[in-house]
């Protein structure tokens, strides 16, 4: 019998009945064995098929088998009830062999002419299966030319059967306080050839509780523990199961914070499997109670290892720790069932007593001594000689500790001396120099340096005088012997003051003129207001109404007098101002340059002469009476004038001190 | 982790101010605690002067009310302890630190100051 | 001022001992919000005080489990199970409960 082509010859080729396409003989026998490669098939179909018809095709016969199993047994021309003929079919080999059998009997009533086929090696699909048949593998399935591969789905692995998928579900950390975790693709069935390990682990202290939930479905056996497929919970005390069956396992309390659920699976099976929820428990905290004038929060039922609460205190307490401040407040509680701090109170706010104000004074108003959240103090100045600048004075004790004024200020208010009080007030009339009595210049300042000059108190810090009476002393203000509060030039009781800082007018060049001839001392401490001490105003910018030509100021100092010697008491005068254009004419003949006296100066005194200022008195206040606020202003600043003080036709020049208003007060406020 | 670095001159004349600055790193002093000020005399002896809270409210030894002083600049993170009219008996280690449930729980390494004419 | 007397001044020691200190104040430390706020400190040479134990009892961060405080009212005691070589120092106890805040003269741990 012909075998055929075999493997790796190219297999097809065409098979026919001995004598084709003439009548076959009798007693024939044909067998012809076709073998393909692996992984392939063989097609055979039937171009002419006319073989002596008899029932079940006993007498002649076309027969297809393949391994053990016949495929057909083919003759007649046409297939009746009980006999097949091939027609149009195609048949294919179960493997990759195909054996075909004729044969003829020992006669024929008719002449039949056989059979022609033809047949060709294809590659088998192992993909493809009949229905109702096991899948060729368990997730993907990839046919290639002569043969097949299995895949898998993310989170499985090929088993080494080469077909299974097994889950990959080890290694899976369950770190929250409660959770959920099910067998894989729950709740559709559970994958095969599997072994997974589940971990729940939770910090030291708490202890996880098991539930089973919704269904329960692992393989099971009737006589046998969990034979094929099983559920495994250990912790580090003791192991639960093995589970499997239909029915939920009870609630599995652990009383461990670590827990390992260990899911083995076999190869056969189709099971849905279990679905675990977990809690986790531990000893709980004593339960908060709020402190009075405060409230905790969240508030819950009980609070556990990692629970947390908060203290918020009302509006007008604070949270203090014993006495310690604090901002905020969380508790946490702890594994030994203790909270991780002490609780602390919410404590009336104490805005603690109120700061002393230089010159003024305070009053409890709510009640003495009362200084906690919402009480109320006055501050007030010293009458007379101060009045308070900014607020009314009025304090209240907030919630954040701080006294605080109507304005939200936290600052203290400022008690400003009253400036321009005297004890003298402007008769009208010219006469000549005279001595001061108590309080009528309490502005006056001596300046003992080099030599002798003045100034006036601004404020109760600073000095306005001459840049000229200073200029020495510029570098070294400490050296600078400052008086005040005092009538005698030599008594040994007056109130001293001592220079911090001495600023000089920037345009002011020594020697050269006394243009801008102003300075201003900063003292190093504030001294004390009262009537022999009282700073002068600076001039409002209506001053100019007050000092216009013929408008009488005054002019004091310890300066050189008519004997020429150095006042012992101060002195005074009261004198004119003087036509600018006059005045300036009076110093355009020598010996004193062109353009002596600049619009920064103003000149007073009278053309007869005898009134005048004179060395000793440079540096001092010309001063003026503002009858609208009754208040007495500094005009001019002792300057210079003619060699002879007193002259007939010369005039005492002083510095403008309108002109300076923007200096003074930056050096003022800058410093 | 919050840190504290005192500094300041380590000696200073009789009846002047002792001034000292304590530097936070790691944390602002706006934000929570009190900020103090201890010493520690020759002889070991530790003294509380005083804090400043968060808030910037202070609160002083009493015996030290009258020449004490703790104020802050919260935009360098410092606070500052001024102490006036020192006397030799103020010659000390000082320290500044930080208190939460407990006093001091965070501490400066501290700066000898010593007084001497 | 509350005075804090602290027993004995000097504790000789040799490693692995327990250690005990005893602090006594003049009056009861019990704030009035129910805490008390007693603390301990320890010192060595060169270095600033460290926080060991505060409110009684509980360890400040970082201080290992030997260390333990106890008392109540006006008498504390601070105990070290095994004293370690970086043990050695000065101890210091200090109360919080009243202003002014008051240390103890403190206990030299030394060894024997």
């Known amino acids: 019998t012909p075998l055929g082509p075999k493997w790796p010859e190219p297999v097809f080729g065409r098979l026919a009945s001995p004598g084709f396409p003439g009548e076959y003989a009798n007693d024939q026998e044909r067998r012809w064995t076709l073998t393909a490669p692996p992984g392939y098939r063989l097609r055979l179909y039937f171009t002419h098929f006319d073989l002596e018809l008899s029932h079940l095709c006993e007498y002649d016969f076309v027969k297809l088998s393949s391994g053990a199993k016949v495929l057909a047994t083919l003759c007649g021309q046409e297939s009746t009830d009980t006999e097949r003929a091939p027609g149009k079919d195609t048949f294919y080999s179960l493997g990759s062999s195909l054996d075909i059998t004729f044969r003829s009997d020992y006669s024929n009533e008719k002449p039949f002419t056989g059979f022609e086929a033809f047949y060709a090696a294809e590659d088998i699909d192992e993909c493809q299966v009949a229905p109702g048949e096991a899948p060729t593998c368990d997730h993907h399935c990839h046919n290639h030319l002569g043969g097949f591969y299995c895949s898998c789905r993310a989170g499985y692995v090929l088993h080494r059967n080469k077909r299974t998928c097994s889950a990959l579900c080890s290694g899976q950390v369950f770190t929250q306080r409660s959770g959920e975790l099910s067998s894989p693709e729950y709740p559709r069935p559970y994958p095969k050839l599997s072994s997974c390990t589940y971990s729940i682990s939770l910090e030291e202290g708490f202890s996880v509780i098991l539930d089973f939930v919704e269904s329960f479905d692992v393989e099971t056996h009737p006589e046998t523990l969990c034979p094929y497929d099983f559920l495994k919970i250990q912790t580090d005390r003791e192991e639960h199961g093995p589970f499997c069956g239909k029915t939920l396992p009870h609630r599995i309390e652990t009383k461990s914070n670590t827990v390992t659920i260990t899911f083995v699976t076999d190869e056969s099976g189709d099971h849905t499997g279990w679905k675990i929820h977990y809690t986790s428990t531990a000893q709980p905290c004593p339960y908060p109670m709020a402190p009075p004038n405060g409230h905790v929060s969240p508030v819950q039922a009980k609070y556990i290892l990692k629970d947390s609460f908060s203290i918020f205190c009302e509006t007008g307490y604070e949270l203090l720790q014993g006495h310690l401040p604090l901002k905020s407040f969380t508790a946490v509680c702890q594994k030994d069932g203790s909270w991780d701090r002490p609780m602390p109170a919410c404590s009336i706010v104490d805005c603690g007593p109120p700061d002393d104000l230089p010159s003024g004074r305070v009053e409890y108003i709510t009640g003495p001594g009362v200084t906690t959240y919402k009480a109320v103090i006055q501050y007030s100045c010293e009458e007379t000689f101060y009045t308070m600048k900014v607020n009314d004075g009025k304090y209240v004790c907030e919630a954040d500790g701080f006294w605080t004024s109507s304005k939200g200020e936290k600052s203290l208010p400022v008690c400003e001396p009253v400036c321009g009080l005297s004890a003298r007030t402007t008769g009208g009339r010219i006469y000549g120099g005279q001595k001061a009595k108590p309080g009528d210049f309490p502005w006056q300042v001596l300046i003992l340096g080099g030599t002798t000059a003045a100034g006036a108190l601004l404020y109760d810090n600073w000095v306005l005088t001459a840049a000229h009476a200073v200029y020495e002393q510029k570098h070294d203000a400490s050296a600078l012997d400052i008086r005040m509060g005092t009538l005698k030039r030599l008594s040994p009781h007056y109130t001293q003051a001592w220079s911090e800082a001495v600023f000089i007018h920037e345009g002011y060049t020594h020697d050269a003129g006394f243009d801008n001839d102003i300075a201003l001392i900063k003292l190093n401490n504030k001294v004390v207001i009262n009537s022999n001490i009282t700073p002068i105003c600076l001039p409002r910018k209506e001053a100019e109404s007050f000092m216009r030509t013929d408008d009488i100021g005054t002019a004091s100092g310890w300066g050189l007098t008519q004997r020429g010697f150095l006042a012992r008491n101060l002195m005074y005068v009261d004198i004119p101002i003087v036509d600018h254009q006059k005045c300036t004419a009076a110093y355009e003949k020598p010996p004193y340059p062109r353009g002596s006296v600049t619009a920064n100066m103003l000149c007073a005194g009278l053309e007869s002469g005898g009134k005048d200022s004179c060395r000793g008195d440079s540096g001092g206040a010309l001063v003026f009476l503002d009858s609208e606020t009754e208040r007495w202003f500094v005009g001019g600043i002792v300057s210079w004038g003619s060699m002879n003080c007193g002259e007939a036709g010369q005039y005492g020049v002083y510095t403008k001190v309108i002109n300076y208003i923007p200096w003074i007060e930056n050096i003022i406020s800058d410093f | 982790e919050v840190q504290l670095q005192e500094s300041g001159p380590g000696l200073v004349k009789p009846s002047q101010s002792l001034s000292l600055a304590c530097t936070v790193t790691?944390?602002?002093?706006?934000?929570?605690?009190?900020w103090h000020w201890i010493r520690q005399f020759p002889g070991n002896k530790l003294e509380w002067m005083g804090f400043?809270?968060?808030?910037?409210?202070?609160n002083y030894n009493p015996p030290l009310t009258s020449r004490i002083s703790i104020t802050r600049d919260t935009s360098k993170n410092q606070f500052f302890l001024q102490l006036n009219s020192v006397t030799t008996e103020d010659t000390a280690t000082y320290y500044c630190?930080?208190?939460?449930?407990?006093?001091?729980?965070?501490w400066g390494q501290g700066t000898l100051v010593t007084v001497s004419a | 001022n509350v005075l804090m007397t602290q027993t004995p001044l000097s504790l000789p020691v040799s490693l692995g001992d327990q250690a005990s200190i005893s602090c006594r104040s003049s009056?009861?430390?019990?704030?009035?919000?129910?805490?008390?706020?007693l603390e301990w400190y320890m010192q060595k040479p060169g270095q600033s005080p460290k926080l060991l134990i505060y409110?009684?009892?509980r360890r400040f961060s970082g201080v290992p489990d030997r260390f333990s405080g106890s008392g109540s009212g006006t008498d504390f005691t601070l105990k070290i199970s095994r004293v370690e070589a970086e043990d050695l120092g000065v101890y210091y106890c200090?109360?919080?409960?009243?202003?002014?805040?008051?240390f103890g003269a403190g206990t030299k741990l030394e060894l024997k």
């Open positions: 400043i809270s968060y808030s910037g409210r202070t």
């Open positions: 630190a930080r208190s939460y449930d407990y006093w001091f729980g965070y």
């Open positions: 200090f109360q919080g409960s009243h202003v002014p805040v008051t």
């Open positions: 009056q009861s430390l019990v704030h009035s919000n129910g805490n008390t706020y």
């Open positions: 790691g944390y602002s002093i706006t934000s929570d605690y009190a």
């Open positions: 409110t009684v009892s």
